[in-house]
Amino acid sequence: LAGETGQEAAPLDGVLANPPNISSLSPRQLLGFPCAEVSGLSTERVRELAVALAQKNVKLSTEQLRCLAHRLSEPPEDLDALPLDLLLFLNPDAFSGPQACTRFFSRITKANVDLLPRGAPERQRLLPAALACWGVRGSLLSEADVRALGGLACDLPGRFVAESAEVLLPRLVSCPGPLDQDQQEAARAALQGGGPPYGPPSTWSVSTMDALRGLLPVLGQPIIRSIPQGIVAAWRQRSSRDPSWRQPER
């Protein structure tokens, strides 16, 4: 199980079941809790455990987070008291109120969404709930909408990329991992169309290529051919010194 750096889990042996006070347990004791033990706790005890884990900044595994979330049928109203990444595993339906959802999704933007793989059901249910919360109708997004979505913006399907390229492309640049097929096609079409914020490929400079670095792998031959060749050569030469940057396909 994941834990604080250099810290090993102490065997619990039922220590969660009835300690005088869960918050009195050490991070080392809290670290190793097995799901089976959490399943036997009352909802109130699980809440106490979640709050204690946050207070002591105990790093939890995905399985532990999922297990805790499953037992927190009615999470505490003070979301700030919960481990940030735990929110990713909670059902957003529990925060569908117009005020509750803004608190929930504002916190979610600070969480590490990539703890959940793109296809995970927990992640898939977050985006539609976030869009509903922020009042997004259709596929047209404002800069504020994209900011409010945080890491969930990386999950927006191609139709959003097509309609909101100006505000969304600069965000997709920094998305970890590859975009899906639908997103790639929409991004390619938007870049080829030459609209804002990058303009026509024929006018791109080395700094445009720098700004586009995360999207370079999606550029097709038609786009690459449109970029002034001197710019491509200069950029390739510069970026070859930094192998962490992904190159456009030749």
């Epitope: 109203e77 529990a94 569908s96 117009p98 005020q99």
Partner: antibody, heavy 122, light 112 residues
Framework: QIQLVQSGPELKKPGETVKISCKAS????????MNWVKQAPGKGLKWMGW????????SYADDFKGRFAFSLETSASTAYLQINNLKNEDMATYFC???????????????WGAGTTVTVSS | DVLMTQTPLSLPVSLGDQASISCRSS???????????LEWYLQKPGQSPKLLIY???NRFSGVPDRFSGSGSGTDFTLKISRVEAEDLGFYYC?????????FGGGTKLEIK
Amino acid sequence: QIQLVQSGPELKKPGETVKISCKASGYTFTHYGMNWVKQAPGKGLKWMGWINTYTGEPSYADDFKGRFAFSLETSASTAYLQINNLKNEDMATYFCARRRDYGTSHWYLDVWGAGTTVTVSS
Amino acid sequence: DVLMTQTPLSLPVSLGDQASISCRSSQSFVHSNGNTYLEWYLQKPGQSPKLLIYKVSNRFSGVPDRFSGSGSGTDFTLKISRVEAEDLGFYYCFQGSHVPYTFGGGTKLEIK
């Protein structure tokens, strides 16, 4: 204990501006939306709109768009209702009410201020 | 907007009688989460309103069990099984599912 304390009665002339305050205590102010409700003399309750105390974003019912403004002073746990260019039809008692929207069951206006009476007279 | 219509406007009752107030909406107001946020409030003269019932049929804490709410779709009812003197006042239904939220016109419960 949890309460909403509203500012005192106001006597204003048509065309003037009034600003009513609603001070919350006993709970975390930013956890609950603040709603405003109008009650004209001898009439029923009319929902004016609400302000999200977490984001500061107001939402107004159609009849209250334009001259009405909701605002916050979060550090003082206080919500405000300002009415500009007062008209005779604004003469009413204005209530602030906290709306709980936790989980999927507990949605309601559970705590109300005592109301602020605004009299408009030339 | 969802229009809420209450009947009757005035309801004269004898203490100990059952009282029933109806609230009809111009359209269904089920929230996207599947719940119907229909509430009932009582306002006594010179006081602010107080919550009685939330989510159609749930009694708020401290509300006597002689109050009950029911209904679905566009038709809702508040029942008071045995009216007591402290129950007199104005009753309002309220939909809190879709902004703009809306109150019914109110029903005055008075002594016959």
